[in-house]
Every structure is written in structure tokens, then in C-alpha cells.
């Protein structure tokens, strides 16, 4: 593109030239695609509310757990097992948690009367020892409950363990009680208060609306808007058994989904509750299944600080609030429509693919000859020709050759390397269809020339018999009228071309050659047609007529303007034209690539 541009270049508009194919099949395919795409676009627009500007929810949660549990604990007092009944209320079984979570204790293990002193470790694989060598002073094992003194002491009977400085007696490594001590927590209820806000839409609401019956209990179908949940029901919804989970503890998700349509004409903004087990129920024993933690109750006895260590098992409920609020927005609608417009081009892509496929050489040579039902598809070759214009890259090596005894044109796109152009095979290219309208521009003399005496008025064919080869005609000449090239050795092979591939009459002997190419009257008409006020001296006139004759021959024999630009004239034609319109002095320059 040129570097400088004028003001008029700015005020331009380019558009594509299209080919309209009148075809029932392709018309049906086009409308089928358009209808399907339009239906999908409209469906997606409405169902996904893509005309809305959506904003994520901002939320706060507050919970209250209610319920009383009776616990039967088995304790050992002075070597005697006793069953102790105790009542647990909200303060006993819930613990303050950060974030949108609450915890309900379902099981526990107590180690009472711990104080800081030296004592043997609880026997485990890591703490059992046979001598002091199995313990190390100052060693702190991550699994241990204290700091080793380096001594191996008797724990009980003949069992010896490493002595530690710790809260003694050491907590026993034992399984959580079965069934869970607070198994009745299944009947506890939790009230969830959830306030939400969509600041971008200036809209606030909550899950508890005025007039709600607060004696309700959530039910998936019968009471889906009730914010009071029975813990056992939550587990039933996820397909888990509360009593099983209560033993080791677990994590349960309560999901509150707000899908709010804030448009006045379709306003809807209510929560949907769902539940999901969040801990891994398949975890093996070595990876600490369930959910537990330890906490201690500290007290003083005889001025000695003591504690009761409680390993608490329970269920942590995580409340997960998510969702969006959407409101009509013209920009979103325009953006969506813009993003879907490209889909309507799919029909064109698909139909072009069919035309290109069915007009390929593969179909022509391998499918159409054998498959009779595929024959109607041949029409695609016609569509393809109308749709596509093939252009060959105009390399310096590009040349077109036309033999009078061949129906096609040969494209030679290679260096000759000393070989005669006559002998180079090249690639066969179909001859462009003759546009007879061009003939109407020629002078009338060409159309109604009186018959030449002694010749019949029918179309004259080239004389069948071969013109006897003159002694001067080169080896590559087949018509007997060619002359050797006068160009230097390196360029000579370009002019070593005959008008025929096989021996026969020369094209220069045809009447049409004389009328189209050699007629001074026609050539002058063509030159004046281009430049009406052309006035030239004899030598320059000859030069103009000669080049016009070359052009006439190229256009006549090659048809397409693009091919004519790269057409190589046969030697016989070239020399016949030069004979008619000679150069007064100097050598003829020969073919030059136009680009």
C-alpha cells in the first residue's frame, strides 16, 4: 500500500462481490442453518437471561442451634465402672467458630485430672521400649504427648514405655465410643439467618421474610423456604446416616443458592437450599477420618493447676452462599447479539465446504466415474468456477504455451536450464471460454470480408498436409515455419517454441491469423480504439503495430488477460509478425516478464 494517501482515500468503502447460486438444495441448507442458529440464539438469550447484567451475591450468615441431649457416660472410679447420666445443652455441644460455620459435638473422649509432671507414655509402637537405649532425652516425636527424659520405665505390668515430661496421665489412644454419646443430636435444629446484597443493582433481601411460621421445619418439597433445619434431615438428603457420621465426626455443607431475576416484570429472588457432604468418607484409619479436635477445661486443685482434656468429635456445618442477581442491560443484549452474529456464517462455511469438496479433482477422478447417484454433484464444478478465480503467482519463471493441435494450454513455471520451451511438458490448464462479445469491438472489415477468390466460403481448416520443413527450420520446429532465435545463448531456449506439438500445418497459414494478427487495418483500429488521436512516425508505428499484433495473438490463443500477459508466442508467429512489421535496425528484444 502506498505510504502517502490523499484525503479521497479516506472516504472510501470496500464491499465484497458475491456469487448468488440459485439452488434448491443449497437454499434449503442455508435456511436450515439460519433457523437452527436463530432458534438456539433466542433460546439461550431467554433461558440463560443473557440480556441481563449479572452480579455475584454478597452475604452474611448467622446461625442458632437448639436442642437438648442426654448423655450416658461410662467412667472408671476407684477401679469400678460407673454409668453417669448428664444433660448437654447448646452451650455444652456448640463451639464458637469463625466464618459461615457452626459446630455440633456428637461424641467425645475425656482424660480427667491431668497435671504437668513426669510419667510413662501411653503404649504405642513408637513409645514401647525394652531399654533406655530406645528413648532419647529431649526427643519430641510429633505423635508424642511430651518431651522424653531418656528413661524407659514401666507403664503397666511388664509393658515399658519411654518416660516423658507432659500433662499426665497421658491421653489414651483409643477409638471413639460407639454408638456416639450425643447420638440424639440428630434431632437438634438450626435456624439460618442469611442477609444478601447486590450493591450494583442496589438490592437487599434476606431468607426469612416477615410473616414466616417459625415453628416450621425445612422439607425439600413440602417446605422448601423454611430456614429451620433438622440435622438428621440434612444427612438424609445427602444419603448419609447421621448415627454413623456422629461417631467420628464430619463436615457437611449447607448450600444457599440465590438466582435472582431483578427485572420488574419477572421479579424473583428466593433462596434454594441444598446439602453436600464435604469430608472424605472413604478415608482409611491412617489418614484420620472424620472431624475432631481437642480442648481443655482448666481448674486448680490443692493449688496445682489441672485440666480435663476432651477430644471432641462432631460435625462442622459450612454454610456456602452463592448466586447471582441479574437485571436487564441494553449493553449486555447488544454484546450478546454481536457475539452470535458470526454463527450465521456457518451456513456459508458449510456450503462452501460442500462446493469445494464436490468440485475437487478427487471427486472428478475417483467418485463420479463409478457412482451414478453422485452425478448430480458435478454441478458443483460449475459453481466453483463461478465462485473462485484461481491466480498463479507471477514468478519470473511463469510462462504459458498454446499449441494449435492441443485443446488445453500448458503452464510452465520452472527454469528452462537450456532446454527448448517446445520440449518442456508443463502443467495442463483448461483454455478459458471464448468471450465472443470482444469480437464486436473489432472493425466491420473483419466480420464481412468478401470471400477470397478460389476458396470455398465454409470455415477454412488448417491445411491437413504438413508444410515441408525448410532447411533453415530448427530441430524443435513442427510446422516448418520457425526460425532460429537471435537472442543470446542463455535466453535462446525461451523462443524455441513452435505453434504445434506434432508435425502439421502452421497457424500462420490460417485465414484468421492473417485477419486478426497481421491486418494493419485491424491493428490500427485497435491502437486508435485505445488512443483516438494517436499519430506516429513510420518506425514507431511499426513498433506499436508489432506489439499490438503480439498482444492480439496472445489474447486470441490464450483468452484470459492473465494468461496473455505471460504468453510465449511461437517462433513462427513471432517471425511472421516481425516480417509484417519489421524493426528498421537493431535486434528484437524478445519476451519480458510484465512483473
Amino acid at each position: 500500500m502506498p505510504a502517502c494517501c490523499s484525503c479521497s482515500d479516506v472516504f472510501q468503502y470496500e464491499t465484497n462481490k458475491v456469487t448468488r447460486i440459485q439452488s434448491m438444495n443449497y437454499g434449503t441448507i442455508k435456511w436450515f442453518f439460519h433457523v437452527i442458529i436463530f432458534s438456539y440464539v433466542c433460546f439461550a438469550l431467554v433461558s440463560d437471561k443473557l440480556y441481563q447484567r449479572k452480579e455475584p451475591v454478597i452475604s452474611s450468615v448467622h446461625t442458632k442451634v437448639k436442642g437438648i441431649a442426654e448423655v450416658k457416660e461410662e467412667i472408671v472410679e476407684n477401679g469400678v465402672k460407673k454409668l453417669v447420666h448428664s444433660v448437654f445443652d447448646t452451650a455444652d455441644y456448640t463451639f464458637p467458630l469463625q466464618g459461615n460455620s457452626f459446630f455440633v459435638m456428637t461424641n467425645f473422649l475425656k482424660t480427667e485430672g491431668q497435671e504437668q509432671r513426669l510419667c510413662p507414655e501411653y503404649p504405642t509402637r513408637r513409645t514401647l521400649c525394652s531399654s533406655d537405649r530406645g528413648c532419647k532425652k529431649g526427643w519430641m516425636d510429633p505423635q508424642s504427648k511430651g518431651i522424653q527424659t531418656g528413661r524407659c520405665v514401666v507403664y503397666e505390668g511388664n509393658q515399658k514405655t519411654c518416660e516423658v515430661s507432659a500433662w499426665c496421665p497421658i491421653e489414651a489412644v483409643e477409638e471413639a465410643p460407639r454408638p456416639a454419646l450425643l447420638n440424639s443430636a440428630e434431632n437438634f435444629t438450626v435456624l439460618i439467618k442469611n442477609n444478601i446484597d447486590f450493591p450494583g443493582h442496589n438490592y437487599t433481601t434476606r431468607n426469612i421474610l416477615p410473616g414466616l411460621n417459625i415453628t416450621c421445619t425445612f422439607h425439600k418439597t413440602q417446605n422448601p423456604q423454611c430456614p429451620i433445619f433438622r440435622l438428621g434431615d440434612i444427612f438424609r438428603e445427602t444419603g448419609d446416616n447421621f448415627s454413623d457420621v456422629a461417631i467420628q465426626g464430619g463436615i457437611m455443607g449447607i448450600e444457599i443458592y440465590w438466582d435472582c431475576n431483578l427485572d420488574r416484570w419477572f421479579h424473583h429472588c428466593r433462596p434454594k437450599y441444598s446439602f453436600r457432604r464435604l469430608d472424605d468418607k472413604t478415608t482409611n484409619v491412617s489418614l484420620y477420618p472424620g472431624y475432631n479436635f481437642r480442648y481443655a477445661k482448666y481448674y486448680k486443685e490443692n493449688n496445682v493447676e489441672k485440666r480435663t482434656l476432651i477430644k471432641v468429635f462432631g460435625i462442622r456445618f459450612d454454610i456456602l452462599v452463592f448466586g447471582t442477581g441479574g437485571k436487564f442491560d441494553i449493553i449486555q443484549l447488544v454484546v450478546y447479539i454481536g457475539s452470535t452474529l458470526s454463527y450465521f456464517g456457518l451456513a456459508a462455511v458449510f456450503i462452501d465446504f460442500l462446493i469445494d469438496t464436490y468440485s475437487s479433482n478427487c471427486c472428478r477422478s475417483h467418485i463420479y466415474p463409478w457412482c451414478k447417484c453422485c452425478q448430480p454433484c458435478v454441478v458443483n464444478e460449475y459453481y466453483y468456477r463461478k465462485k473462485c478465480e484461481s491466480i498463479v503467482e507471477p514468478k519470473p519463471t511463469l510462462k504459458y504455451v498454446s499449441f494449435v493441435d492441443e485443446s488445453h494450454i500448458r503452464m510452465v513455471n520452472q527454469q528452462l536450464l537450456g532446454r527448448s520451451l517446445q520440449d518442456v511438458k508443463g502443467q495442463e490448464v483448461p483454455r478459458p471460454a471464448m468471450d465472443f462479445t470482444d469480437l464486436s469491438r473489432l472493425p466491420l472489415a473483419l466480420h464481412d470480408t468478401p470471400p477470397i477468390p478460389g476458396q470455398p466460403e465454409e470455415i477454412q481448416l488448417l491445411r491437413k498436409e504438413a508444410t515441408p520443413r525448410s532447411r533453415d527450420s530448427p530441430v524443435w520446429c513442427q510446422c516448418g515455419s520457425c526460425l532460429p532465435s537471435q537472442l543470446p545463448e542463455s535466453h535462446r531456449c525461451l523462443e524455441e517454441l513452435c505453434c504445434r506439438k506434432k508435425p502439421g500445418a502452421c497457424i500462420t497459414t490460417s485465414e484468421l491469423f492473417r485477419k486478426l494478427v497481421l491486418s494493419r487495418h485491424v491493428l490500427q483500429f485497435l491502437l486508435l480504439y485505445q488512443e483516438p488521436l494517436l499519430a506516429l512516425d513510420v518506425d514507431s508505428t511499426n513498433s506499436r503495430l508489432r506489439h499490438c499484433a503480439y498482444r492480439c495473438y496472445a489474447t486470441w490463443r490464450f483468452g484470459s488477460q492473465d494468461m496473455a500477459d505471460f504468453a510465449i508466442l511461437p517462433s513462427c508467429c513471432r517471425w511472421r509478425i516481425r516480417k509484417e512489421f519489421p524493426k528498421s535496425e537493431g535486434q528484437y528484444s524478445g519476451f519480458k516478464s510484465p512483473y
Partner: nanobody, 129 residues
Framework: EVQLVESGGGLVQPGGSLRLSCAAS????????MGWFRQAPGKEREFVAA???????DYGDSVKGRFTISRDNSKNTVYLQMNSLRPEDTAVYYC???????????????????????WGQGTLVTVSS
């Protein structure tokens, strides 16, 4: 679950050498600390040698300098090379394995029989002229 099979035991003259092998089943062999223990008739089981999953070794006081423990993880096998054997080395030799997947066994604990979860059937070594 790991199965351990000892081999290489037999009768040997004092001052002689013997090489015991212990083949372990299971793909996680490289995560186990392996040990050799022995038990003479009427005596307690005694620590001989051990090698952790990361290659550190420990030997019983009575065998230091004479016995060498090694392992070949590609063959899932642990070896005990016994040189300069004495009549008091006569015993049933047991191979043992301790899982170190969730944490390494401290070096000072390698000699503790309590650390080892899996045990072989034993192979008899008799040192006699």
C-alpha cells in the same frame, strides 16, 4: 500388607561367612525400614542390624564390625552379610519391616522390636565346628 521370606541360613564353621536374604512382597518396599533380629533357644529376641528407608544403619553391640546390612529396592530385598561368625551367633534370624510412609523411624528406635509391624518366619543359622 507385607510378606517377608528369609533365606540363606545353614551350618557354618566358626570364623566362616554367611549371607542372609529377606525378600519382601509389595510395591512400597522402599518406604519400609528393615531390620534383622535373632533369638537363641531360651533367650529373648535380640536386635542384630537395621536399615531405614533412606539408608541409615544401626547394629547391635555384639555384631558391630562383623555384620553388614544392605538393601536392594529394585529387588525388594534386604541382605545381612555375616563375617567372622562365632558359636554364640547360633540362633533363628528374623527379618522385620517398619512402615515409614507416614514418618521416618528415628535412628535410636531402629533397634526396638516394637517398631516393626511385619515379621518373617525366620531362618536358622548354626555356627559349629
Amino acid at each position: 500388607e507385607v510378606q517377608l521370606v528369609e533365606s540363606g541360613g545353614g551350618l557354618v564353621q566358626p570364623g566362616g561367612s554367611l549371607r542372609l536374604s529377606c525378600a519382601a512382597s509389595g510395591r512400597t518396599f522402599r518406604h519400609y525400614a528393615m531390620g534383622w533380629f535373632r533369638q537363641a533357644p531360651g533367650k529373648e529376641r535380640e536386635f542384630v542390624a537395621a536399615i531405614s528407608s533412606y539408608g541409615s544403619t544401626d547394629y547391635g553391640d555384639s555384631v558391630k564390625g562383623r555384620f553388614t546390612i544392605s538393601r536392594d529396592n529394585s529387588k525388594n530385598t534386604v541382605y545381612l552379610q555375616m563375617n567372622s561368625l562365632r558359636p554364640e551367633d547360633t540362633a533363628v534370624y528374623y527379618c522385620a519391616a517398619a512402615d515409614e510412609t507416614l514418618g521416618a523411624v528415628p535412628n535410636f528406635r531402629l533397634h526396638e522390636k516394637y517398631e516393626y509391624e511385619y515379621w518373617g518366619q525366620g531362618t536358622l543359622v548354626t555356627v559349629s565346628s
